[in-house]
């Protein structure tokens, strides 16, 4: 009686159980009553990562530099290529199918957390007493200059984008 189900690493075809092709190989022809399943290795830049009955291997993933990607791990006949982001870029999702340049913090904002390969720059507004006058992915808010410690006085108040301007103390004339 013909089987209705097959063992693991087998598949049912024409009322008989044939062996699946091992990872790294594709199906050329099904088994028959007299012959085994015929499989062939995947070609260069191709892979299959499971026991299968695929007639075509999959192309290795292309790590597109236009999307900020580079090869982290080269693929084999049994594994796909793994991409990661170029330096200064981060993934747009956990699967990392594309990357974008790290965000810079605008003047008036400082870097709270420097970006990584999987997370973007986190910016924070410069609080009173601090400033940032540059657009940067690294610079934190800087404290206003302390005029007093230099024996000077504040001539122009600081903002979140500018430092204070210090000047000499007005001497009282006799």
């Amino acid at each position: 009686e013909p089987p209705t189900a097959c063992r693991e690493k087998q598949y049912l075809i024409n009322s008989q159980c044939c062996s699946l092709c091992q990872p790294g190989q594709k199906l050329v022809s099904d088994c028959t009553e007299f012959t085994e399943t015929e499989c062939l290795p995947c070609g260069e830049s191709e892979f299959l990562d499971t026991w299968n009955r695929e007639t075509h291997c999959h192309q290795h993933k292309y790590c597109d530099p236009n999307l900020g990607l580079r090869v982290q791990q080269k693929g084999t006949s049994e594994t796909d290529t793994i991409c990661t982001c170029e330096e200064g870029w981060h993934c747009t999702s956990e699967a990392c199918e594309s990357c974008v340049l790290h965000r810079s913090c605008s003047p008036g904002f400082g870097v709270k957390q420097i970006a990584t390969g999987v997370s973007d720059t986190i910016c924070e507004p410069c609080p009173v007493g601090f400033f940032s006058n540059v657009s940067s992915a690294f610079e934190k808010c800087h404290p206003w200059t302390s005029c007093e410690t230099k024996d000077l006085v504040v001539q122009q108040a600081g903002t979140n984008k500018t430092d204070v301007v210090c000047g000499p103390q007005d001497r009282l004339r006799a």
Epitope: H58, S93, H102
Partner: antibody, heavy 116, light 108 residues
């Protein structure tokens, strides 16, 4: 050859649930995500959501409550279900290769009409 | 909610004209912007990725620029086959994956 193809009903009644299937070939769903995008007649493209190569599902904020996207890597299929269909959901529904990324490979699209 | 505003919504131009379409994001998306061309009854075709990089097989008369919130698609010399609708798309994150409203380029 790398292809993606949508299939499902062409006519859905209001309040019913739409189920569309995207069948892929030439690539593995473990390597690439798939997204769903729709386009009402004469209107702009709308991103509905997608599923990443790692199996994470993502949804447009306005559609989150009505959408489910799932996949079967062995069958090479990604399934979109959209509940409580309304005539304003009449559109051409596309699947495209990629999760949160750009879409270089699109299906031909399937026109779904919502009408009683 | 995150938005992409495309302008103009339509424009008339002649063959050989220089055409510029803009796309503005409601918050910074760095370089996470793509441009597509769509013709009636067809799926969109990818033109530009990463705000300024030409997709494979796209003619060099197309170019993209911008970063952060303001982006531009330029067609340096409009050809008969370029009359179509153009869309921008952001892909900075899942919460900002959105298409613009489209720009229809018509024959003057």
């Amino acid at each position: 050859e790398v292809t993606v193809k949508e299939s499902g009903p062409v006519l859905v009644k209001p309040t019913e649930t739409l189920t569309l299937t995207c069948t892929v070939s030439g690539f593995s769903l473990s390597s690439y995500g798939v997204s769903w995008i729709r386009q009402p007649p004469g209107k702009a493209l709308e991103w509905l959501g997608g599923i990443g190569s790692d199996g994470s599902a993502y949804y447009a904020s306005w559609a989150k409550s009505r959408l489910t996207i799932s996949r079967d890597t062995n069958l090479k299929q990604v399934v979109l279900t959209m509940t409580n269909m309304d005539p304003v959901d009449t559109a051409t529904y596309y699947c495209a290769r990629g999760g949160i990324t750009v879409y270089a490979m699109w299906g031909q699209g399937t026109l779904v009409t919502v009408s009683s | 909610a995150f938005q992409l505003t495309q302008s103009p919504s339509s424009l008339s131009a002649s063959v050989g004209d220089r055409v510029t379409i803009t796309c503005q994001a409601s918050q910074s998306i760095s370089t996470g912007l793509a441009w597509y061309q769509q013709k009636p009854g067809k799926p969109p075709k990818l033109l530009i990725v990463g705000a300024s990089n030409l997709a494979s097989g796209v003619p060099s008369r197309f170019s993209g620029s911008g970063s952060g919130t303001d982006f531009t698609l330029t067609i340096s010399s409009l050809q008969p086959e370029d009359f179509a609708t153009y869309y921008c798309q952001s892909y900075f994150s899942s919460s900002s994956t959105v298409f613009g409203g489209g720009t229809k380029v018509e024959i003057k």
